[in-house]
């Protein structure tokens, strides 16, 4: 998941030269930016989150807020500071006229300002059948560990915490930050106010219809009786959780955010901070039948974003809309006709549908996994959720054609045993945002902080691309793909793996002078090849066919087109071994695949040759997929021949460590 989406409206107001009597001027050359929701009806003008630079102290935040009030008063404007943020993000929430934005953007320490906007609940007993491994019967669903060591925070509506299904499992905190209900004739009916939250609490930890029957929950009210909240209210809720965590550190925390609003830089930033403080956040992908990257918190890379499927593992349709999709979704989970506690009475059940219900399932699974292995990091948990998911069961035809390749075909499932997965080398595929069509456009895919980038590939629907390369950025490797002239844009695809004690580096060979092609290998002692990338400056790589990698030949070598620079990802980690596996098809074919066998994990996926009719290569679970242009356009010449090259790795060290534990 990335947050580089073009649809997000950003207004940049340049700082003027005169300082308007400020004691402290902003650093030279910096420009604070203004952001607002791209979905007009969801905007809440008049309330703004002023986000200050990362190192800003609480006292400076308060001083900046007071300065804004004083300067606004001099101009005859009333302002009201509604909240001063600290603990998660520095900043403050202010009620003021939009006329003051230019003034506010010039204040010292200001990083950016975001106009407040609305967030919404995302809801409109096969569910336990789907997430339960076959050896359990759903009618006697007794999970191996009920999540008893984990606390799940639910940010939602009010809830009926004494419902028979959840009594004693949910502690209602005194946190409440909700907007007024719309409409003068709105009648608050308690059971309706509690409906969404009660149902989700039941899905997570209900006695009879819950996923993690042992999990305890804490609820924060951020959605009103109509299921509507605000970005600012959600931020203050997340801050409340962080402060609670600091005051009284407990075991693992899962935060369930069964809500969605338009893309929000500040909400995504708050989620990132909380995730980096060791909290697992799970959110609804959204019910808009749209790209989840256009919504928050769904688009936050650190959050586990969940789409909804039905009993037949098909994407859920909700009226004219349905589940969101795309690269910002991590996985899907049951989200149609989910039975759960109903606030209509203390013993009632009801079925509800939506990505909220799907997210609640994953929060429950996460609670159980963390209860079994409390030391799991967010990256480890995400990788396990992906690893244990049902693969390739979703009918992708439901998704728009351009989103199919980007959307994970994964439906969440409980691991057959919550222990003993430690030996596995876990990897996942991360797609970048689309680069856009300009000649020099690039796209960047990043791994999570505690994942290793083991390989990098690229993909373009038009086939016009200039390959990809791994490069250092902020002390970490990233995967950058390059668009070509006349191309409609590219994607970068990172293969992100959990490899403890790894030491990885990239070795590059410039384009070869000779006609035999470019080669590069891992020359350091103990380093093995985990991935190959190639990047070229020319607009069109000709039909030159380089020699193809051979498993028995040079296992630590990447081979590519003579006009391309070749990049080898070389890693040293205890017990790491890798091998190259190829599948070449002499006749032209739109798709060539090669898979790693049982016990091995795909770390690298590339195509040979790198000629222009190859659209690109990407990993889907443990299979390397190489896509080429439509056969009818390439003809059936030898240029159509394509080889998919997979690099498959395993860790003997992890396997031994796991055997010693058992």
């Amino acid at each position: 998941q990335e947050d580089e989406d073009g649809d997000y409206e950003e207004l940049v107001l340049a700082l003027r030269s005169e300082e308007d009597g400020l004691a402290e001027a902003p650093e030279h050359g910096t420009t604070a930016t203004f952001h607002r929701c791209a979905k007009d009806p969801w905007r809440l003008p008049g309330t703004y989150v002023v986000v200050l630079k990362e190192e800003t102290h609480l006292s400076q935040s308060e001083r900046t807020a007071r300065r804004l009030q004083a300067q606004a008063a001099r101009r005859g404007y009333l302002t009201k500071i509604l909240h001063v943020f600290h603990g998660l993000l520095p900043g403050f929430l202010v009620k003021m006229s939009g006329d003051l934005l230019e003034l506010a953007l010039k204040l010292p320490h200001v990083d950016y300002i975001e106009e407040d906007s609305s967030v919404f609940a995302q809801s409109i007993p096969w569910n336990l059948e789907r997430i339960t491994p076959p050896r359990y019967r759903a009618d006697e669903y007794q999970p191996p560990d009920g999540g008893s060591l984990v606390e799940v925070y639910l940010l939602d509506t009010s809830i009926q915490s004494d419902h028979r299904e959840i009594e004693g499992r949910v502690m209602v905190t005194d946190f409440e930050n909700v907007p007024e209900e719309d409409g003068t004739r709105f009648h608050r009916q308690a059971s309706k106010c509690d409906s969404h939250g009660t149902h989700l609490a039941g899905v997570v930890s209900g006695r009879d219809a819950g996923v993690a029957k042992g999990a305890s929950m804490r609820s924060l009210r951020v959605l009103n009786c109509q299921g509507k909240g605000t970005v600012s209210g959600t931020l203050i809720g997340l801050e409340f959780i962080r402060k609670s965590q600091l005051v009284q550190p407990v075991g693992p925390l899962v935060v369930l955010l069964p809500l969605a609003g338009g893309y929000s830089r500040v909400l995504n930033a708050a989620c990132q901070r909380l995730a980096r403080a060791g909290v697992v956040l799970v959110t609804a992908a959204g019910n808009f039948r749209d790209d989840a990257c256009l919504y928050s918190p769904a688009s936050a890379p650190e959050v586990i974003t969940v789409g909804a499927t039905n009993a037949q593992d098909q994407p859920v349709t909700l009226g004219t809309l349905g589940t969101n999709f795309g690269r910002c979704v991590d996985l899907f989970a049951p989200g149609e006709d989910i039975i759960g506690a109903s606030s209509d009475c203390s013993t009632c059940f009801v079925s509800q549908s939506g990505t909220s219900q799907a997210a609640a399932h994953v929060a429950g699974i996460a609670a159980m996994m963390l209860s079994a292995e409390p030391e799991l990091t967010l990256a480890e948990l995400r990788q396990r959720l992906i690893h244990f998911s049902a693969k390739d069961v979703i009918n992708e035809a439901w998704f728009p054609e351009d989103q199919r390749v980007l959307t994970p075909n994964l439906v969440a499932a409980l691991p057959p045993s919550t222990h003993g997965a430690g030996w596995q080398l876990f990897c996942r595929t991360v797609w970048s945002a689309h680069s856009g069509p300009t000649r020099m456009a690039t796209a960047v895919a990043r791994c999570a902080p505690d994942e290793e980038l083991l390989s990098c590939s690229s993909f373009s629907r038009s086939g016009k691309r200039r390959g990809e390369r791994m490069e250092a950025q902020g002390g970490k490797l990233v995967c950058r793909a390059h668009n070509a002239f006349g191309g409609e844009g590219v994607y970068a695809i990172a293969r992100c793996c959990l490899l403890p004690q790894a030491n990885c580096s990239v070795h590059t060979a410039p384009p070869a002078e000779a006609s035999m092609g470019t080669r590069v290998h891992c020359h350091q002692q103990g380093h093995v090849l985990t991935g190959c990338s190639s990047h070229w400056e020319v607009e069109d790589l000709g039909t030159h066919k380089p020699p193809v990698l051979r498993p028995r030949g040079q296992p630590n070598q990447c081979v590519g087109h003579r006009e391309a620079s070749i990049h080898a990802s070389c890693c040293h980690a205890p017990g790491l071994e890798c091998k190259v596996k190829e599948h070449g098809i002499p006749a032209p074919q739109e798709q060539v695949t090669v898979a790693c066998e049982e016990g091995w994990t795909l770390t690298g996926c590339s195509a040979l040759p790198g000629t222009s009719h190859v659209l690109g290569a990407y990993a889907v679970d443990n299979t390397c997929v190489v896509r080429s242009r439509d056969v009818s356009t390439t003809g059936s010449t030898s240029e159509g021949a394509v080889t998919a090259v997979a690099i498959c790795c395993r860790s003997r060290h992890l396997a031994q460590a796991s055997q010693e534990l058992q």
Epitope: S161, D162, E167, A190, R207, C345, S346
Partner: antibody, heavy 115, light 109 residues
Framework: QVQLVQSGAEVKKPGASVKVSCKAS????????ISWVRQAPGQGLEWMGW????????NYAQKLQGRGTMTTDPSTSTAYMELRSLRSDDTAVYYC????????WGQGTTVTVSS | QSALTQPASVSGSPGQSITISCTGT?????????VSWYQQHPGKAPKLMIY???NRPSGVSNRFSGSKSGNTASLTISGLQAEDEADYYC?????????FGGGTKLTVL
Amino acid sequence: QVQLVQSGAEVKKPGASVKVSCKASGYTLTSYGISWVRQAPGQGLEWMGWVSFYNGNTNYAQKLQGRGTMTTDPSTSTAYMELRSLRSDDTAVYYCARGYGMDVWGQGTTVTVSS
Amino acid sequence: QSALTQPASVSGSPGQSITISCTGTSSDVGGYNSVSWYQQHPGKAPKLMIYEVTNRPSGVSNRFSGSKSGNTASLTISGLQAEDEADYYCNSYTSTSMVFGGGTKLTVL
């Protein structure tokens, strides 16, 4: 610690009403309702119903047939069970217990219906 | 709601194990994960011994265990002790209410 303290014994005539109270302490009231259970002399336990501290909602056993009313007063952390049109077979020990899970019980209130 | 069926009495010698059964239907015991067991000594309030079929509240001896198969739940007491002599009641959710068993008198010989 979690405690439920009930009102004292009552002796009533047939046709009269009785109101038994149950004061809760030591836990978050709104996380649990109160169940009422009775036990006639030498007999087993009989669930009478449940009442919510959160919103005052009730769930009565069919057998009460409209003779019983359960209420709560969150300001005093007290639940009440009123039984009207008492008959001799209503003679029993009346217990309040925490929630549907009935994990904590009051000491019991003996109600004797005798002419 | 008809009561769940329990044996009227069971007995055992100190140190032995005994099992008390509780039979219902798919609408109560068989349909829910929420079967509880209570111990009641004469003149005292009932005490929760097992909840949600298998779980023991803190402070309850691990000699007490619960299980369920189909429409029948069971309470097993191992290593019988004199203080275990009491009445035992099972309880289950039904769709809208709660139902108790008729009770079982346990005698420690």
